[in-house]
C-alpha cells in the first residue's frame, strides 16, 4: 500500500465560477424629465439615460419605459441616489399659501413591479426634510440593498416631486442594479 493515494470519502464538487463580466448589470443616469401621468397613490417615476455618458446596460439587462427589466432570477444589489434642489422660501410659502405641490419633505422609493402581482412593491424608501436646510439647498438621498428578484421583475425609481430633481449632472442622480 506504500505510496497509494486515497480519495476522500466525501468529495466536494465545485460548480465552475461564473465570470462577473457576463452577469446582468446596469447603471442609469439622470436626464431631463418630461411631465407624465402617474398612478393614483403612487409617486411619479423617473426617466433615465441608459446609454450616453456613464450610463450602460449589459448582459440582457434592459431599460425601457422607466423600468429596469430583470433578465434572470437571482440576488441583485439595487441602488439609487436622487439629488434634489430648491429654495427654502418655498417652505414658508407652503404654510402661508397651502401649496401642496411644494412639499416640506422629499421622498425616493425604489419600486418593484411583478406582472403576476397586482400591486407594486416598495423595496426601499428614503425621506428627508427640506425646510430645515439653507436658502439654496441640495439634498441627496441614497438607497441601496440586496434583494432576491425573479426574471421579468421590473424596477423603477419614484420621487415625491419630479420638479425638484437635480438633472444637471450624471454623477448626482443615478439608478442601477447588478446580479451578485
Amino acid at each position: 500500500l506504500k505510496g497509494q493515494e486515497f480519495a476522500p470519502s466525501h468529495q466536494q464538487v465545485y460548480a465552475p465560477l461564473r465570470a462577473d463580466g457576463d452577469k446582468p448589470r446596469a447603471h442609469l443616469t439622470v436626464v431631463r424629465q418630461t411631465p407624465t401621468q402617474h398612478f393614483k397613490n403612487q409617486f411619479p417615476a423617473l426617466h433615465w439615460e441608459h446609454e450616453l455618458g456613464l450610463a450602460f446596460t449589459k448582459n440582457r439587462m434592459n431599460y425601457t419605459n422607466k423600468f429596469l427589466l430583470i433578465p434572470e432570477s437571482g440576488d441583485y444589489f439595487i441602488y439609487s441616489q436622487v439629488t434634489f434642489r430648491g429654495m427654502t422660501s418655498e417652505c414658508s410659502e407652503i404654510r402661508q399659501a397651502g401649496r401642496p405641490n411644494k412639499p416640506d419633505s422629499i421622498t425616493v422609493v425604489i419600486t418593484k413591479v411583478t406582472d403576476s402581482y397586482p400591486e407594486p412593491t416598495q423595496l426601499l424608501m428614503g425621506t428627508k426634510s427640506v425646510c430645515e436646510v439653507g436658502s439654496n439647498w441640495f439634498q441627496p438621498i441614497y438607497l441601496g440593498a440586496m434583494f432576491s428578484l425573479q426574471e421579468g421583475d421590473k424596477l423603477m425609481v419614484n420621487v415625491s416631486d419630479i420638479s425638484l430633481v437635480d438633472y444637471t449632472k450624471e454623477d448626482k442622480t443615478f439608478f442601477g442594479a447588478f446580479l451578485l
Partner: antibody, heavy 118, light 107 residues
C-alpha cells in the same frame, strides 16, 4: 433661445486635419451631449461622435481612428478635429445638442461646408 | 451598427393630402426613434422624439407611431411648408444612425 454656430475653414487639403468649432449661445454647454454630424453631397446624415460637458467622448467606430473632440466650458465651445482627410470627407458639418437618448437632437447649427481639395 | 431603412425614398403629394412615411430598424430600438425635417441649405429640425412625442413648437398635424423595429411618421394634412426631406434616426445605441431620407415633393 439656444443657438449653435459652426466655424472653421471651408477648404482643407488632402492628408491634412479638418478643424471645426461650435459655439453655443443662449444656454449652458453643461449637462448636455454635443455631437458632430455630417452630410456628404448627395448622401445621408452620418453621426461622427459626441462629447459630454465632462469631456468624455464617444466616436463612430468608422471614424474613430481619425477623430478628436474637445470642449471648453468656459467659452461655451466644443471642437472637432478630423485627421488625414480625403475627398470623401467633403461634407456639410453640423454640430447638434442631445439632452439624452430619449430626446433626439433638439438643436442644430446651420452647418458649414468643408471641401477637401488640393 | 443599427441600420435604418426608410420608405418610400420619395413621394409626390398635394396640399391637404395625408402622408405617411415608414422607417424600419435592423433590430429592436424600443421607442428610441426620432423624426427630422430638412430643407435645402438648412439644418435638420426635430419634429418627433421617442416615437410619438411632439417637439415643442411643431404643428399637431405631425404625428408618429410604432415600436420595436417598425415606425411611421404621418402628416395629417400636408401644408405648402411641409414639402421637404424627412429623416428618421435611432437613439437607442451609438453610433447614432439615420434613415436615408424621404423627399416629399409637390404633385
Amino acid at each position: 433661445q439656444v443657438q449653435l454656430q459652426e466655424s472653421g475653414p471651408g477648404l482643407v487639403k488632402p492628408s491634412e486635419t479638418l478643424s471645426l468649432t461650435c459655439t453655443v449661445s443662449g444656454g449652458s454647454i453643461s449637462s448636455y451631449f454635443w455631437s458632430w454630424i455630417r452630410e456628404p453631397p448627395g448622401k445621408g446624415l452620418e453621426w461622427i461622435g459626441y462629447i459630454y460637458y465632462s469631456g468624455s467622448t464617444n466616436y463612430n467606430p468608422s471614424l474613430k481612428s481619425r477623430v478628436t473632440m474637445s470642449i471648453d466650458t468656459s467659452k461655451n465651445q466644443f471642437s472637432l478635429k478630423l485627421s488625414s482627410v480625403t475627398a470623401a470627407d467633403t461634407a456639410v458639418y453640423y454640430c447638434a445638442r442631445e439632452i439624452g437618448s430619449y430626446y433626439g437632437f433638439d438643436y442644430w447649427g446651420q452647418g458649414t461646408l468643408v471641401t477637401v481639395s488640393s | 451598427d443599427i441600420q435604418m431603412t426608410q420608405s418610400p425614398s420619395s413621394l409626390s403629394a398635394s396640399v391637404g393630402d395625408r402622408v405617411t412615411i415608414t422607417c424600419r430598424a435592423s433590430q429592436s430600438i424600443n421607442n428610441y426613434l426620432n423624426w427630422y425635417q430638412k430643407k435645402p441649405g438648412k439644418a435638420p429640425k426635430l419634429l418627433i422624439y421617442a416615437t410619438s412625442s411632439l417637439q415643442s413648437g411643431v404643428p399637431s398635424r405631425f404625428s408618429g407611431s410604432g415600436s420595436g423595429t417598425d415606425f411611421s411618421l404621418t402628416i395629417s394634412s400636408l401644408q405648402p411648408e411641409d414639402f421637404a426631406t424627412y429623416f428618421c434616426q435611432q437613439s437607442y445605441s451609438t453610433p447614432r444612425t439615420f434613415g436615408q431620407g424621404t423627399k416629399v415633393e409637390i404633385k
